[in-house]
Structures are given as structure tokens and as C-alpha cells.
């Protein structure tokens, strides 16, 4: 079990890389001028409490930033939110955080990351481009839910 | 408001089991851990086990486990606590509670009224 | 496994300050065990008070605190109230497993 965030590159199948603007997180494409935000990735240490087969549950956090992706209900709708977090606070916490923790599941060189509070719920981006990251329960329609990550450092 | 109500009082005979239960209100049992504490008279309280109820999942203290069973049925909001080979040294208040995260951190919050186990042959 | 320890009764005088404590046997108590604090009034249900060391409950009042001292988890009640006379449990966290002291009495006389 790793005991360090890994840092790593994230973009979508677009070659869109995730960018802080506003303390939102948004999609656009890779241009010279674009600052991508590089993720800190830690997988939950308490993996034999959550469920298998879903994929490595894991705390995905802005390197350098203590900002930390999390999922709550807005309305009776689950959204994605940036908080003010140290992803090794949540990483050593008695219990899973599930509202901050992700199921990362991986077929060739695809990501998804699926929402361990609200199953069946993943981050994705709308297919234009310079949109917030959202959830969506709809894979492959109008949303990308599947992400490429490259391991940095 | 959040409430913990559990079921009533017990008196079982040495070798027999019980199961007893803790209804959940006022919030989704799914977004939290409840957890099962004990205090047999004159003591202080001693952890037994947990539950996540989304999940189903359990841990033990290592001194319970295997005695311990923690289940929960969140169409009823229930979680209940089987104790099984009972003893006499296992007549104690039998607790639920609920650990919840708020903040920055996990609070064991709120607190069923306990339930009196009485093992007596 | 662990024992943890608390004062078995203490007493403050209304007004005054008293800090009760919580040791382990395994060594100091550190921000890992995410010391617990519950309180138990006579004829009312457990309360949680504090969290993660040092961090209080919703609702909690500003006169309770938790901190470490001298290699113990501690509850701190600064202007203590008639109404604050109860049990006072505390519980820390051994990497899977809870652990619950004894509980300490405190009377406000």
C-alpha cells in the first residue's frame, strides 16, 4: 500500500487536461499556454473494508494545493467539489472518508473514477471543451468518463 | 433529529445467544459507521465492533471476533449485534453508536439507550 | 492490546478548570489515535464531544477542548458548569481497532 500521493498527469481521451480556474476544475485542450494541474493519487489504507471488484479506491487531491475531490448532494443530486484538504489527513483516517474516496478502475490505458458515496456516479467531462468536471451516471453519451493518467516523477 | 433507539432488555442462560438492534432515524444509516460498545457493571466501556452499513463490511476488536456478529438491514435502518456462547462476564449495557465524519474528523456522536444483556444461569 | 487509562474521579469547583487525561499503555498518545471524548450525564444519553484530538462536535460548547499533554490525550473544561458533572470516556484508535478507557467522574462542587 502506497504511504506517499503519487503524482499524476490526468487527460481525457480528447487530450483534454484538467485546469483550476476559480477553484473549479475544468477541461480544456492542451495548448502552450495551458497550466494542468498535476493529481496526487493515494489509495485508501483501509481497501479491505470497501468493496471488491469495483476497482482501487483511492483520494484524489490538487499536488501542492491541500484541495481534495469530493462528492456531495446538491439537492438530491450528487456533485463533484473541490475542498480544503490534505489528502494525507484523509488517508489516515480511522474509517474511509467516502465522501472524498473514488473506485479507480483501469481496462488498457483507461480510467475511470467512480464516486464510492454515490455508486454508479463517475467523474466526467462534458464533450466540449472548457467545462467543469461533473458526475454522471451516463458512461459514453454525451459525457468522457474515461481519463488516460501518466504517472509523473 | 438523529436517534438510535434500541430493542429491550434480555436475560439468556450461559452457551445461549442474543441479538440485539439499534434503529437508525433522522439521517441515512448508509453515511455513516455504527458501531457496538459494552459496559458491564462498574467498568468502563469496551469496544466491540463495527459496521458500514452501504457496504455490509465489519471489523472486530480481536477479543470478540468470532463471538461478534454485526449485520444491518438499511431498508429498516436497523443494525443489530448477535452475541453468541454467552457468559456470565458477558452481562454488560450493550451500546450502539454512530461514528460520523464531520469537519475534518470522526465523531462517535450519537448514542442508542443501551440495552441490558443479563446472563444468568 | 492496549489499556487505556483515565483519572477515576476528579472534582472542580464551579467556575474553575479542570483537564482530565487519557493514557495508553502501548506508549504516547499521538494524533494517530484520533482521540475520542463521549460524555454521560446522569439519565441522558452518551454525547460525543470531541474528535480527532482536538476538534469538537457540533454544538459542543467553546469550553470544552482536547489536546495532547505530556504524552496523554486530554479534555480540558475551562468554567465549569453545574451542569457539566458526568462521566467523561475517551477512546483511541490502534490502527484497526478502538480502544475505550475506564472513564473518569468529574463532580462540580
Known amino acids: 500500500k502506497s504511504e506517499m500521493p503519487q503524482p499524476v498527469s490526468i487527460q481525457d481521451i480528447n487530450h483534454r487536461v484538467w485546469v483550476l480556474q476559480d477553484q473549479i476544475l475544468i477541461a480544456v485542450p492542451r495548448k502552450d499556454r495551458v497550466s494542468p494541474v498535476t493529481i496526487s493519487l493515494i489509495s485508501c489504507r483501509h481497501v479491505e473494508t470497501l468493496e471488491k471488484d469495483r476497482g482501487n479506491p483511492i483520494y484524489l487531491g490538487l499536488n501542492g494545493l491541500n484541495l481534495c475531490l469530493m462528492c456531495a448532494k446538491a439537492g438530491d443530486q450528487p456533485t463533484l467539489q473541490l475542498k480544503e484538504k490534505d489528502i494525507m489527513d484523509l488517508y489516515n483516517q480511522p474509517e474511509p472518508v467516502k465522501s472524498f474516496l473514488f473506485y479507480h478502475s483501469q481496462s488498457g490505458r483507461n480510467s475511470t473514477f467512480e464516486s464510492v458515496a454515490f455508486p454508479g456516479w463517475f467523474i466526467a467531462v462534458s464533450s466540449e471543451g472548457g467545462c467543469p468536471l461533473i458526475l454522471t451516471q451516463e458512461l459514453g453519451k454525451a459525457n468522457t468518463t474515461d481519463f488516460g493518467l501518466t504517472m509523473l516523477f | 433529529q438523529v436517534q438510535l433507539v434500541q430493542s429491550g432488555a434480555e436475560v439468556k442462560k450461559p452457551g445461549a445467544s442474543v441479538k440485539v438492534s439499534c434503529k437508525a432515524s433522522?439521517?441515512?444509516?448508509?453515511?455513516?459507521?455504527i458501531h457496538w460498545v459494552r459496559q458491564a457493571p462498574g467498568q468502563g466501556l469496551e469496544w466491540i465492533g463495527r459496521i458500514d452499513p452501504a457496504i455490509g463490511t465489519t471489523r472486530y476488536d480481536p477479543k470478540f471476533q468470532g463471538r461478534a456478529t454485526i449485520t444491518t438491514d438499511t431498508s429498516t435502518s436497523t443494525v443489530y449485534l448477535e452475541f453468541s456462547s454467552l457468559r456470565s462476564e458477558d452481562t454488560a449495557v450493550y451500546y450502539c453508536?454512530?461514528?460520523?465524519?464531520?469537519?475534518?474528523?470522526?465523531?462517535?456522536?450519537?448514542w442508542g439507550q443501551g440495552t441490558l444483556v443479563t446472563v444468568s444461569s | 492490546q492496549a489499556v487505556v487509562t483515565q483519572e477515576p474521579s476528579l472534582t472542580v469547583s464551579p467556575g474553575g478548570t479542570v483537564t482530565l487525561t487519557c493514557r495508553s499503555s502501548s506508549g504516547a498518545v499521538t494524533t494517530s489515535n484520533y482521540a475520542n471524548w463521549v460524555q454521560e450525564k446522569p439519565g441522558q444519553l452518551f454525547a460525543g464531544l470531541i474528535g480527532?484530538?482536538?476538534d469538537r462536535a457540533p454544538g459542543v460548547p467553546a469550553r470544552f477542548s482536547g489536546s495532547l499533554l505530556g504524552g496523554k490525550a486530554a479534555l480540558t473544561l475551562s468554567g465549569a458548569q453545574p451542569e457539566d458533572e458526568a462521566d467523561y470516556f475517551c477512546?483511541?484508535?490502534?490502527?484497526?481497532?478502538?480502544?475505550f478507557g475506564g472513564g473518569t467522574k468529574l463532580t462540580v462542587l
Open positions: 480527532g484530538t482536538n
Open positions: 433522522g439521517f441515512n444509516i448508509k453515511d455513516t459507521y
Open positions: 477512546a483511541l484508535w490502534f490502527s484497526n481497532h478502538w480502544v
Open positions: 453508536a454512530r461514528l460520523h465524519y464531520f469537519g475534518n474528523n470522526f465523531f462517535f456522536d450519537y
